[in-house]
Interface confidence: medium
């Protein structure tokens, strides 16, 4: 019989939700020449619910309109999980000096307004780095603009107007570095059609070892939205990716860098990233740096990461203790590091998944240890999961939601901590609360700077 | 610069056994469907195995099937062929090959080979 | 299984010469999923074409290919001596993959 027409959408939306996993989110479906193994539907769903958590959609684990309308979104044809080219974590350019050549010029533009666009997009990364860039008209250039239509030789074909409007290879030779434009789309210097130097500061974003950004005001966002041009700022997230990689700019620096100076300690609106006891002290940490507490002394100082441990990253987003082992454990992005009687242990970092969480889980926001209950708590977003430290594996029936079992905590936090033997310090924003777990509720509202006296 | 180096061939008797390796470097390993293809001597190219990239899904030619078992270890960017009941036929110069993410209007295609090792020769002889 | 077969078994020819080698599918290969691979003498492949028509990258303009459905070309507008060697199709539209038994291409 034939399939009635809602039976038919339902099914084309099935293969272009498949298609647009696959594309982006690494979904192994082998339905071709590897295997005529089927994937399993918990695959599927596993991997909608990892691109709802990436994109910022209610996650559902199902096509509904929303991630459908996101699936059909204008968008870069980089994926957000990394299947492409090195990206994240991968090469960066191991000079300061890049070379770039535009190989050939859209028809949709005058060819002024494409150096023009081009160039100003180069710009805005050089303005956040020691970077310097300088176009070139002949030759080799270490990254090459290039405008083509469909299959251009790369693995990559264009799919026609909309959909994959460009993309663009991680630093390296050849290939690498090169970012491709989608000559199908109507290139503009305006908000009509698709602005080519929002999409290239994008593009060149990729060009230079950053991946895709979950922040939606990022400009490493994978899908595309007009916004002012005149106005146009990286955000934070963006400026912190790329510094990440490069620094920040050495001489002239005309947009401040979040990380680069020491934040004031007793600034009202003073937030952290990460907080954990390590034995008698208190470790807080934000952005490149760390204060000390010592437990009932006033006095704190300020250090920086790389000061105490050369080979661990600025930006560490949860920490926790297990005091009787003598291991503290820090985390940034999908990476741990285990830190032993203060020392970086080898063979770190790793993944996080080794804890057993799903695959759509790409950063923890805190992390706490009980020790009565020889339990950790993980808390991602809006949710939370238990992981038995003696058992090495999470506890059943998680996640669960922060704010039914964390009363008056939440829907999410930025860092946690426990102390005294009955209380976490749950940190959000500028907040602080002290939450009696034996009582299951809060007992003090603080500001998150209260430690240290302000 | 990508290098896929294959090692592990040689010379074994039919029934006999041999487990073939593939050390990978210049690339996310692990992002990466991979395949074994042999040649036998001057003949053509032959599908042995794949696998996908990590390591959840494989395939065999059915000639291969139920003698052979691809796997591979991510952590050390390396792929494998357990070869097990060799035949004469078996014999070819097996290539370590990778697989790239290419995407065309109709969908997605793991399905041609963008880079092959040196390869090495098993030789199944009484 | 789609066989592939490759014609002519071996090409004749001289430095400079048009080469039309030919690649045929017992079925229609689906959204041109075909590739031609280059083997010289005692060295491994390398990727020539994919799509059927789309050069891989580093792959100069001489080296052409086209055709859809079950009958394929590679063609090499001007022959230079490192293209004397093997030429093999592929096809990567239906499981398993398959390779044609390759055209060799020597000097006359």
């Known amino acids: 019989l034939p399939l009635n027409s809602s039976t038919s959408l339902e099914k084309n939306n099935v293969l272009f939700g498949e298609r647009y996993l696959e594309k982006f989110y690494g979904l192994e479906i082998n339905k071709l020449p590897v295997t005529k193994m089927k994937y399993s539907g918990n695959l599927m769903k596993e991997k909608i619910q990892e691109m709802q958590h990436f994109l910022g959609l209610k996650v559902t684990g199902q096509l509904d309109t929303s991630t459908l309308e996101m699936m059909h979104a204008p968008r870069c044809g980089v994926p957000d999980v990394h299947h492409f080219r090195e990206m994240p974590g991968g090469p960066v350019w191991r000079k300061h000096y890049i070379t770039y050549r535009i190989n050939n010029y859209t028809p949709d533009m005058n060819r002024e307004d494409v150096d023009y666009a081009i160039r100003k997009a180069f710009q805005v990364w050089s303005n956040v780095t020691p970077l310097k860039f300088s176009k070139i008209n002949t030759g080799m250039a270490d990254i090459l603009v290039v405008f083509a239509r469909g299959a251009h030789g790369d693995f990559h074909a264009f799919d026609g107007k909309g959909g994959i409007l460009a993309h663009a290879f991680g630093p390296g030779s050849g290939i690498g570095g090169d970012a491709h434009f989608d000559e199908d789309e109507f290139w503009t210097t305006h908000s009509g059609g698709t602005n080519l130097f929002l999409t290239a500061v994008h593009e060149i974003g990729h060009s230079l070892g950053l991946g895709h950004s979950s922040d939606p005001k990022a400009v490493m966002f994978p899908t595309y939205k007009y916004v002012d041009i005149n106005t146009f700022r990286l955000s934070a997230d963006d400026i912190r990716g790329i510094q990440s990689l490069y620094g920040d700019p050495k001489e002239n620096q005309r947009l401040p860098n979040p990380d680069n100076s020491e934040p004031a300690l007793c600034d009202p609106n003073l937030s952290f990233d990460a907080v954990t006891t390590v034995g008698n002290k208190i470790f807080f940490f934000k952005d490149r740096f760390f204060w000390l507490k010592v437990s009932e002394r006033p006095k704190t100082s300020v250090n920086l990461i790389s000061s105490l441990w050369p080979t661990l990253p600025s930006g560490i987003e949860a920490a926790y203790e297990i005091e009787a082992r003598n291991q503290v454990f820090l985390f940034k992005d999908d990476k741990y590091w285990l830190i032993s009687n203060l020392r970086p242990e080898p063979n770190y970092p790793k993944s996080i998944h080794s804890f057993g969480f799903p695959n759509f889980v790409k950063k923890i926001d805190a992390a706490v240890f009980n020790p009565r209950f020889y339990r950790t708590y993980f808390f991602v977003d809006n949710q939370y999961w238990r992981y038995d430290e003696r058992r090495q594996m999470m506890d059943p029936g998680y996640p669960k939601l922060i704010t039914k079992n964390f009363q008056g905590i939440g829907p999410k936090i930025d860092a946690v901590f426990y102390s005294k033997n009955k209380y976490y310090y749950f940190f959000q924003g500028s907040n602080q609360f002290e939450y009696d777990f034996l009582l299951q509720r809060i007992t003090k509202t603080l500001k998150s700077n209260s430690w240290f006296g302000c | 610069e990508v290098q896929l180096l294959e090692s592990g061939g040689g010379l074994v008797q039919p029934g006999g056994s041999l487990r073939l390796s593939c050390a990978a470097s210049?690339?996310?390993?692990?992002?990466?469907q991979m395949w074994w293809v042999r040649q036998a001597p001057g003949k053509g190219l032959e599908w042995v195995s794949?696998?996908?990239?990590?390591?959840?899904?494989?395939g065999y030619a059915d000639s291969v099937k139920g003698r052979f078992t691809i796997s591979r270890d991510n952590s050390k960017n390396t792929l494998y062929l357990q070869m097990n009941s060799l035949r004469a036929e078996d014999t070819a110069v097996y290539y370590c090959t990778r697989v790239p993410h290419y995407y065309d209007s109709s969908g997605y295609y793991g399905g041609l080979v963008d880079y092959w090792g040196q390869g090495t020769l098993v030789t199944v002889s009484s | 299984d789609i066989q592939m077969t490759q014609s002519p078994g071996i090409l004749s020819l001289s430095p400079g010469d048009r080469a039309t080698l030919s690649c045929r599918a017992s079925?229609?290969?689906?959204?041109?999923?075909l590739a031609w691979y280059q083997q010289r003498p005692g060295q491994s492949p390398r990727l020539l074409i994919y799509?059927?028509?789309s050069r891989a990258t580093g792959i100069p303009d001489r080296f052409s290919g086209s055709g859809s459905g079950t009958d394929f070309t590679l063609i090499i507008s001007r022959l230079e001596p490192e293209d004397f060697a093997s030429y093999y199709c592929?096809?990567?539209?239906?499981?398993?993959?398959?390779f044609g038994p390759g055209t060799k291409v020597d000097i006359k």
């Open positions: 799509g059927a028509s």
């Open positions: 079925q229609s290969v689906t959204s041109s999923s």
């Open positions: 592929q096809q990567y539209g239906g499981s398993p993959i398959t």
């Open positions: 210049g690339f996310t390993f692990s992002t990466y």
């Open positions: 794949g696998i996908s990239s990590s390591g959840g899904a494989t």
